[in-house]
């Protein structure tokens, strides 16, 4: 009986550890600056790293610029977006800017896209300053279903800071759906 | 056998509860304003509370101004940094400010320091206003190894808001590394 | 014995799953704009949705404008607050604004209220711009006891963005208290 108990304990430790890991998808995606769109209009950012530097992904999929949910659950989603301009990189079209981020969820079954989180600021980046910088952070707790897709839209993509510590988004599963 | 089953259940409840708690290090550190550096340059903030007010730590270590990881895992890291200036505290050296935070990871084995997250804004704090305030929030999900150290650097440390609800950083473990 | 082991495994899977779900309260509350106070003073926001759109709640209670903790634990708390003004909605009383958020905890046993997190910025919203926008995000890890209440205060409530993706706050339990 004691041997059985040890076996139960052993298999349980193994099972608990395994199921715990399997139950916790995550992603941290960092901007791929080689392919950032130009212009000041709102665009969906499709180029992200998922496997270099701080970027990583597990039990989720990155495809066509979208983070795809593989496992139903409640997830904490976050994004950090940095914009910057140095006078040496040329003129801004306008000094009045709307620097925004939108984190959206797309359901393929019911083709629709909805904004989960938004953030940002209107800014006056005058020519009196040599350098301008601004960061946005958003985060929230959302129910996501397998197959749903998370994407990030920004205004003024040409002003994005291309560093991996500056412009990124991510998700991690916190709990199952009842 | 039933007695054994009860014992298994009992020990498992105990073990599960214990291992779950042991598996979840966390820290929430609040600024210790008695020792904030002056100046406008970028500095590492080394004085933080870990055991008063909202500040707390468990299964992590705070030493020499750094938050030390004791347990491998994936952690959610965050920082909230508030800057403020009131006209009664004297003139600013310049009205054009770069208010920034950098959350960095240092590995002792391979002596190197890397920025995990950055945020902030350039600001024009004109003399027309009696009071100026600005807050930065950053957060992200990172793989941390035992022995690695997390620290926070800011520009313009003399402008930091010393309240515990204003300037803080923290971490909590979300899952093990596979 | 094998039958007993299977029973142990079965009951454990069931128990583990059940206890895991029960152990993870959460809430994501979105602004109810039908009842936003006017003025520029600091007010407690009491109207939030908890069961429509992205808003949801489990093992926590929403009552009298406050999020009530039902289960002791360490929670990650967050808030995202967006302010906006369009010239078509009339003049601002002043162009110099203090746009702030305060996330507070109230203990009923010891009637007291304390700010856990604050964020925001002073802004100059000049008449030269058609549109102004600014978002604040705060987040942190806190020990909460059953019966404690979380509420959100803001300055300039009349400028709040009423969208569910813009103005929200939430919490999710990360771990038990030792």
């Amino acid at each position: 009986i004691r041997a059985e108990k040890a076996m139960v304990d052993g298999s349980w430790l193994d099972l608990a550890k395994r199921s715990k890991l399997e139950a916790q998808p995550f992603a941290h995606l960092t901007i791929n600056a080689t392919n950032i769109p130009t212009g000041s209009h709102k665009v969906s950012l499709s180029s992200w790293y998922h496997d270099r530097g701080w970027a990583k992904i597990s039990n989720m999929t990155f495809s066509n610029g979208k983070l795809i949910v593989n496992q139903d659950g409640f997830y904490y989603l976050y994004a950090n977006i940095c914009f910057r301009h140095h006078e040496t990189s040329g003129d801004l079209a306008t000094e009045y800017l709307q620097l925004m981020v939108y984190v959206t969820k797309t359901s393929i079954k019911i083709p629709s896209s909805h904004t989960l989180m938004k953030g940002g600021s209107t800014k006056y980046w005058s020519g009196n300053s040599e350098f301008h910088f601004y960061s946005i952070n958003v985060g929230g707790f959302f129910k996501l279903r397998s197959g749903e897709e998370i994407s990030v839209e920004v205004s003024n993509p040409s002003l994005l800071d291309p560093d991996q510590d500056a412009t990124y988004f991510g998700a991690f599963k916190v709990r199952d759906i009842d | 056998i039933r007695a054994e089953k009860a014992m298994v259940d009992g020990s498992w409840l105990d073990l599960a509860k214990r291992s779950k708690l042991e598996a979840q290090p966390f820290a929430h550190l609040t600024i210790n304003a008695t020792n904030i550096p002056t100046g406008s340059h970028k500095v590492s903030l080394s004085s933080w509370y870990h055991d008063r007010g909202w500040a707390k730590i468990s299964n992590m270590t705070f030493s020499n101004g750094k938050l030390i990881v004791n347990q491998d895992g994936f952690y959610y890291l965050y920082a909230n940094i508030c800057f403020r200036h009131h006209e009664t505290s004297g003139d600013l050296a310049t009205e054009y400010l770069q208010l920034m935070v950098y959350v960095t990871k240092t590995s002792i084995k391979i002596p190197s320091s890397h920025t995990l997250m950055k945020g902030g804004s350039t600001k024009y704090w004109s003399g027309n206003s009696e009071f100026h305030f600005y807050s930065i929030n950053v957060g992200g999900f990172f793989k941390l190894r035992s022995g690695e150290e997390i620290s926070v650097e800011v520009s313009n440390p003399s402008l930091l808001d010393p309240d515990q609800d204003a300037t803080y950083f923290g971490a909590f473990k979300v899952r093990d590394i596979d | 014995i094998r039958a007993e082991k299977a029973m142990v495994d079965g009951s454990w899977l069931d128990l583990a799953k059940r206890s895991k779900l029960e152990a993870q309260p959460f809430a994501h509350l979105t602004i109810n704009a039908t009842n936003i106070p006017t003025g520029s003073h600091k007010v407690s926001l009491s109207s939030w949705y908890h069961d429509r759109g992205w808003a949801k709640i489990s093992n926590m209670t929403f009552s009298n404008g406050k999020l009530i903790v039902n289960q002791d634990g360490f929670y990650y708390l967050y808030a995202n607050i967006c302010f906006r003004h369009h010239e078509t909605s009339g003049d601002l009383a002043t162009e110099y604004l203090q746009l702030m958020v305060y996330v507070t905890k109230t203990s009923i046993k010891i009637p007291s209220s304390h700010t856990l997190m604050k964020g925001g910025s002073t802004k100059y919203w000049s008449g030269n711009s058609e549109f102004h926008f600014y978002s604040i995000n705060v987040g942190g890890f806190f020990k909460l006891r059953s019966g404690e209440e979380i509420s959100v205060e803001v300055s300039n409530p009349s400028l709040l963005d009423p969208d569910q993706d813009a103005t929200y706050f939430g919490a999710f339990k990360v771990r038990d208290i030792d």
Partner: antibody
Framework: DVQLQESGPDLVKPSQSLSLTCTVT?????????WHWIRQFPGNKLEWMGY???????NYNPSLKSRISITRDASKNQFFLQLSSVTTEDTATYYC??????????WGQGTLVTVSA | DIVLTQSPATLSVTPGDSVSLSCRAS??????LHWYQQKSHESPRLLIK???QSISGIPSRFSGSGSGTDFTLSINSVETEDFGIYFC?????????FGAGTKLELK
Amino acid sequence: DVQLQESGPDLVKPSQSLSLTCTVTGYSITSAYSWHWIRQFPGNKLEWMGYIHFSGVTNYNPSLKSRISITRDASKNQFFLQLSSVTTEDTATYYCATRRETGFTYWGQGTLVTVSA
Amino acid sequence: DIVLTQSPATLSVTPGDSVSLSCRASQSISKNLHWYQQKSHESPRLLIKYASQSISGIPSRFSGSGSGTDFTLSINSVETEDFGIYFCQQINSWPLTFGAGTKLELK
């Protein structure tokens, strides 16, 4: 005070390149601001062509991108426009101008260039 | 590219009249619009920036209004020196574009 002066040929043959010089006095073109070429067609329509920034960065109108080049000679405080493969459609008055706080605040007096065989 | 449409193409007025010139953008450009005046045989001159902001040295009879897609340049009591062509220009995004102009002429 800042002054800008365009110079170059009045007549260019089709398929050739048009080359113009803008000489700036009263301000160094490598100190600040951006330095632009704008043209005005017969009938008065204005078209922004592109600029060279004080840092040396250039930005061109996509409609001209394959044909346009703006360069400078800092020692002479001059910047240049080159437009290749011209046609009669490129007949216009060409202005150089500087942009400050997003407005074209100083202009040259303009030079008329005719593209004709 | 953002297209700016000005109307009317020509406006015939008598000195002392007050006039309004219109500029419409093909998409919303907030207040990212400037106005220029060009007199005969001269280079354009900046009159108004960001839809309504005055420029140092420009007479106060010139004023601008509007945002989004619809903009107006007003001249309160036209003087003889005001005759010429008026252009709007968008600075919302590259490439910068101009309207075709409104010619203000003597009636």
